[in-house]
Structure formats: structure tokens, C-alpha cells
């Protein structure tokens, strides 16, 4: 028994005075606790505890289940213990077959012995199967067998505690080890859609998928910059061992504009945390915003092609699209398609393909689009650049030579005089009158210019050239005339195309 110096409280003394006691099944257990301040006896085995306020603990007919630790405690809280084995050849093990272990931790197979003198106390696999090679264990007859550093691979391992008794192997009832995995990575989180656009009153529902090795992963939906608890529903599945999936669905049955914002799905485990966000935008009504991809004023050369391209945002989805010119709707030559195949796409593209445009095809081309809430339109002003065309070239009764040319941009008319038989007209002649005339065609058609010179200024035979030109090209007309005496005769106008 322990000894202490006088004056200090001492632990109780127990008779018999040994740490371990072996009795046979059916025999009496008699334990005496001697202490002036005796309080109680406590019995413990597995998770069982019993108390006795008598200083003598007597069990008349011992059973295997009386195997365990008997502790006497005094009023100072000091104690002394004795471990009693009740040897029962028919019941070598006391068991609690609950067996859960955490990965990388030790776990106890609870099969304490009723007889410490049996040999080869160890673990064995069920049905003669060998234990995993790396499984290490430490037997303790009073507690059971400690499996060291549980591995994930031991999950659902079936085993027995085993002893040799009189040369024969005796097995306990079977134990099945359930291994709780350690978190060795953060949870994997994903969201059904990264952004949502809704009209007021529509239902907002978003699902977060959380994947981890076990169901003890924590997850929640949070509104950024808000502490409000959100209503969410869960579904979960175990896809085999160590592959757990949870779906957390957040729903707002009737979304309002002020519900707009960023929602975060947050998950954490003992290793760390992960999150993913989704953005909700709630609008009071739908919208359409059109963005021209080219300038809305377009200049194109005669005979060339041009594509009128718009991008537009439409929510809800566009229902009607059309391209119009001169109050006529195009039935072909255009295409309309979503900018992306993404489910949440609200951006679209419309293209009108104008081919081999003629000078008469300038004008306003309008794209119209509508959805269930709004209409929108955008206009392109198309100008067709045409080289000048000389419409008339005449000698008027008043002696004027007049040249009228049409084209776009507005042509410039220059006059030249070529004396005699020279081929090149270089001497320029100033016009008497220049006017831009109103065209009778559409407002985006060719511009008509009229220019006149006084033929009386010419005193010699020769040729007068009227040259009309713009950025696209040039065209000339010629007046040939000769003098007969004092009179100009034989004026023969003719044109010469100059590219």
C-alpha cells in the first residue's frame, strides 16, 4: 500500500492488497476498503459503472461480467484500485462490439479478458482471412486491443479478438470496424449557375453541390454582407465509401428587387473551407438593350457588300426580330443567334447581309426586336458611294454649256478647254454657275450637281471637257465645236468614261 508523510491525507487501503485479483466464476468476491473518510466503491468495465457506499464490496457468486476495476475513494478524493478477473472458461471475453475509428487515430477493440493467463491475445480476421499487413495493434487484457493509426483501407474490416486456451484458439464475437475518414482536403463546392436574372415575383432557386469524404462536412448558404439565416433544403447521398455528396438548395419563392445581390455557398471541414458564389439580379420588368457592332452611319461602295451587325441584351428571351428597309421586311439575308449557348445567356447577335449594293439601295435599315415586356429598335443609315454619272450635257439657247452629274459623295465638276486637235485638255475654265439640285430619289440617293460655263469665251476650234469626279471615280463629257466665220457650229457632245 502507498505510504505518505504524517499529517497529509492518505489514499484508502484495499484488502486484498494487490493490484490484480483472479477469482473463479461462482466464487465470492470480497473487497475491503479501509479509510476513516471512506466515501464509495466504484466498479468500471467497458462503459459500465456501478457504485457501492458500503466499505466492503461483496459479490457472493462472481460472474464473468464482474470482471473489472474496483476503485475505493475517500472524502479527500484520493483513491486506490484493484482489478478483478473472474475466470470463466465459457466466457473469455467481455465485449462491446461498437467499433468506430477515425483515420490516422488509434481505436480500441473492446474485448477485455476475463482470464489474464491465457496466451497469444491478439486480433484475427474473420473467416480465416489475414489482417492487413500494415495493421499494428497493442493488446491490453484489461481494456481490449488498441489498433494503432487506423487506415481508410480498414473500413468495414471484420475481425475477432483471439486467445489461445489450452492449446486451442478461441475467438470473440465478430467486430466490424467503421472508419471515419480524416479530412485531407477542403470540400469541393459547385453551384448550379453562376448568375441569375429574374423579374420581380419569379422564384429564385439555386443549388450548391458539396462533395467530401464524409457527411460531417459543414455547409451553409450565406447572403454577402448579411447575417440573415437563409431557408435551404438538403438532399444527400453516399456514393460508396468516402464519397459523400450533399445538395443544398436555396429558394426565394417570390424574388424582389432588393433580393438582388451575391449569395455564397460556404463549406468547411477540419482541413479548411471553400466557397462559391452566385449573383442574383432581380429587375422590376424586362428589358432590351441594343449595341451596334459597326457605326450606325455606313458608307459602302457601289457593288460591294456590307454586314449590319447588332448585339443586344434581351430579358426575357426575345420573341420577335426583324430587319426593315423602306417599309419592307427582309425575309432572308439575315440571321439571329444567341451569343453563347450558356443557359443564362441573355446576349444575342443579329446580322443583316447586304450584297452587291446598288446606288439606289442606300437608306435607313432598321432592326426591331421585342420580348414580352418591351420593344426596341436601332437604325443604320447606309450611303452607297457611286461614281459620277453625267446626266445631261447641252448647249443652251443662251450660249451656255451645261453639265449635270449625279453621284455620291457629291461630285465636283471641272471644265477644261482643248484647243485644236490636242488630245489633252489642260486649261481649266471657271464655271459661271454651280448648283446642287434636289434629287427626286430617296434621301440617301445620289447627289445631283449642275455646272455651266459661257461658250462665248472660246474663240478657237476645240473641245470642251466637263469632268465630274468624287472619291469613287470620274466621268467626262466633251463638246466639240468649230468656227465657220464668226459662228460656232457643229457642237457635238459625247462622253468618255474614265475609270
Amino acid at each position: 500500500q502507498p505510504s505518505v508523510s504524517p499529517g497529509e491525507p492518505s489514499p484508502p487501503s484495499i484488502h486484498p492488497g494487490k493490484s490484480d485479483l483472479i477469482v473463479r466464476v461462482g466464487d465470492e468476491i470480497r473487497l475491503l476498503c479501509t479509510d476513516p473518510g471512506f466515501v464509495k466503491w466504484t466498479f468500471e468495465i467497458l462503459d459500465e459503472t456501478n457504485e457501492n457506499k458500503q466499505n466492503e464490496w461483496i459479490t457472493e457468486k462472481a460472474e464473468a461480467t464482474n470482471t473489472g476495476k474496483y476503485t475505493c475513494t475517500n472524502k479527500h478524493g484520493l483513491s486506490n484500485s484493484i482489478y478483478v478477473f473472474v475466470r470463466d472458461p465459457a466466457k473469455l471475453f467481455l465485449v462491446d462490439r461498437s467499433l468506430y475509428g477515425k483515420e490516422d487515430n488509434d481505436t480500441l477493440v473492446r474485448c477485455p479478458l476475463t482470464d489474464p493467463e491465457v496466451t497469444n491475445y491478439s486480433l484475427k480476421g474473420c473467416q480465416g482471412k489475414p489482417l492487413p499487413k500494415d495493421l499494428r495493434f497493442i493488446p491490453d487484457p484489461k481494456a481490449g486491443i488498441m489498433i494503432k493509426s487506423v487506415k481508410r483501407a480498414y473500413h468495414r474490416l471484420c475481425l475477432h479478438c483471439s486467445v489461445d486456451q489450452e492449446g486451442k484458439s478461441v475467438l470473440s464475437e465478430k467486430f466490424i470496424l467503421k472508419v471515419r475518414p480524416a479530412f485531407k482536403a477542403v470540400p469541393v463546392v459547385s453551384v448550379s449557375k453562376a448568375s441569375y436574372l429574374l423579374r420581380e415575383g419569379e422564384e429564385f432557386t439555386v443549388t450548391c453541390t458539396i462533395k467530401d469524404v464524409s457527411s460531417s462536412v459543414y455547409s451553409t448558404w450565406k447572403r454577402e454582407n448579411s447575417q440573415t439565416k437563409l431557408q435551404e433544403k438538403y438532399n444527400s447521398w453516399h456514393h460508396g465509401d468516402f464519397n459523400y455528396e450533399r445538395q443544398a438548395t436555396l429558394t426565394i419563392s417570390s424574388a424582389r428587387v432588393n433580393d438582388s445581390g451575391v449569395f455564397m455557398c460556404y463549406a468547411n471541414n477540419t482541413f479548411g473551407s471553400a466557397n462559391v458564389t452566385t449573383t442574383l439580379e432581380v429587375v422590376d420588368k424586362g428589358f432590351i438593350n441594343i449595341f451596334p457592332m459597326i457605326n450606325t452611319t455606313v458608307f459602302v461602295n457601289d457593288g460591294e457588300n456590307v454586314d449590319l451587325i447588332v448585339e443586344y441584351e434581351a430579358f426575357p428571351k426575345p420573341e420577335h426580330q426583324q430587319w426593315i428597309y423602306m417599309n419592307r421586311t427582309f425575309t432572308d439575308k439575315w440571321e439571329d443567334y444567341p451569343k453563347s449557348e450558356n443557359e443564362s445567356n441573355i446576349r444575342y447577335v443579329s446580322e443583316l447581309h447586304l450584297t452587291r449594293l446598288k446606288g439606289t439601295e442606300g437608306g435607313t435599315y432598321t432592326f426591331l426586336v421585342s420580348n414580352s415586356d418591351v420593344n426596341a429598335a436601332i437604325a443604320f443609315n447606309v450611303y452607297v458611294n457611286t461614281k459620277p454619272e453625267i446626266l445631261t450635257y447641252d448647249r443652251l439657247v443662251n450660249g451656255m454649256l451645261q453639265c449635270v452629274a449625279a453621284g455620291f459623295p457629291e461630285p465636283t465638276i471641272d471644265w477644261y478647254f482643248c484647243p485644236g486637235t490636242e488630245q489633252r485638255c489642260s486649261a481649266s475654265v471657271l464655271p459661271v454657275d454651280v448648283q446642287t439640285l434636289n434629287s427626286s430619289g430617296p434621301p440617301f440617293g445620289k447627289l445631283v450637281v449642275q455646272s455651266s460655263i459661257d461658250s462665248s469665251a472660246f474663240k478657237h476650234n476645240g473641245t470642251v471637257e466637263c469632268k465630274a469626279y468624287n472619291d469613287v471615280g470620274k466621268t467626262s463629257a466633251y463638246f466639240n465645236f468649230a468656227f465657220k466665220g464668226n459662228n460656232k457650229e457643229q457642237i457635238h457632245p459625247h462622253t468618255l468614261f474614265t475609270p
Epitope: D47, R97, K178
Partner: nanobody, 123 residues
């Protein structure tokens, strides 16, 4: 064949009481610490209470402490759960199961679990 058969569930008003029983066959329950677990509609499995092999040690979830009492009769191979002061949030299917994991996680489940008995607490 091992069977755990729960009984005693039913409809009860808030504040009322029920006693659940779990009778085992094909299995000696004295070799297991035993647990009661429950599953509320749309929720995961939640541990409620556990009892040691001989019945002297009992364990409870915070949500039921002071209201529920677990007990066992190894001679009858039966586990019990006395439920008092019942609340709407106690509505669930209650299962008895073999084993007790002090972490409360029960990863990998139980060696054996019953089919459950429905407890509905409603006025």
C-alpha cells in the same frame, strides 16, 4: 437473420409522451452499446441517445437531454426510449441501432439498424 423491430411511434400532441421499444432477434444486444437515431423529413440522420452494454452509462444529444431516457433489458433483448415533453421538432422516424460512436458521426453506419417507427408531434 438479424432483425431490430421498433414500435411505439405515433401521433402525439406537443408536451405529450411516447415510449419506443426495439426488440432484437438473431442478435444478443448485450454485446453492443446501443443507440437511438432519428431522421426528420428532408434532413440527415441525427444521433439521439446511446446506452452502454450493461445499461449503467447513458448518453444524450443536447436537443433531448432532460426529456428523453434510454434504457435496456438485456434479458428481454430489448432497447427502450422514453420520450417526454415532446416538441414539433422531435417529429422524425426513429431507429434503434447497434453501436455507439462517441463522436456522434457514425460514419459507415451501423452493423445493424431497424426499419424505424414514425413519431409525429403536432397539435
Amino acid at each position: 437473420e438479424v432483425q431490430l423491430l421498433e414500435s411505439g411511434g405515433g401521433l402525439v400532441q406537443p408536451g405529450g409522451s411516447l415510449r419506443l421499444s426495439c426488440a432484437a432477434s438473431g442478435l444478443t444486444i448485450s454485446t453492443y452499446a446501443m443507440s437511438w437515431v432519428r431522421q426528420a423529413p428532408g434532413k440527415g440522420l441525427e444521433w439521439v441517445s446511446a446506452i452502454s452494454t450493461g445499461g449503467s452509462s447513458t448518453y444524450y444529444a443536447d436537443s433531448v437531454k432532460g426529456r428523453f431516457t434510454i434504457s435496456r433489458d438485456n434479458s428481454k433483448n430489448t432497447l427502450y426510449l422514453q420520450m417526454n415533453s415532446l416538441r414539433a421538432e422531435d417529429t422524425a422516424v426513429y431507429y434503434c441501432a447497434t453501436g455507439y460512436d462517441s463522436s456522434g458521426h457514425y460514419y459507415g453506419g451501423f452493423d445493424y439498424r431497424g426499419q424505424g417507427t414514425l413519431v409525429t408531434v403536432s397539435s
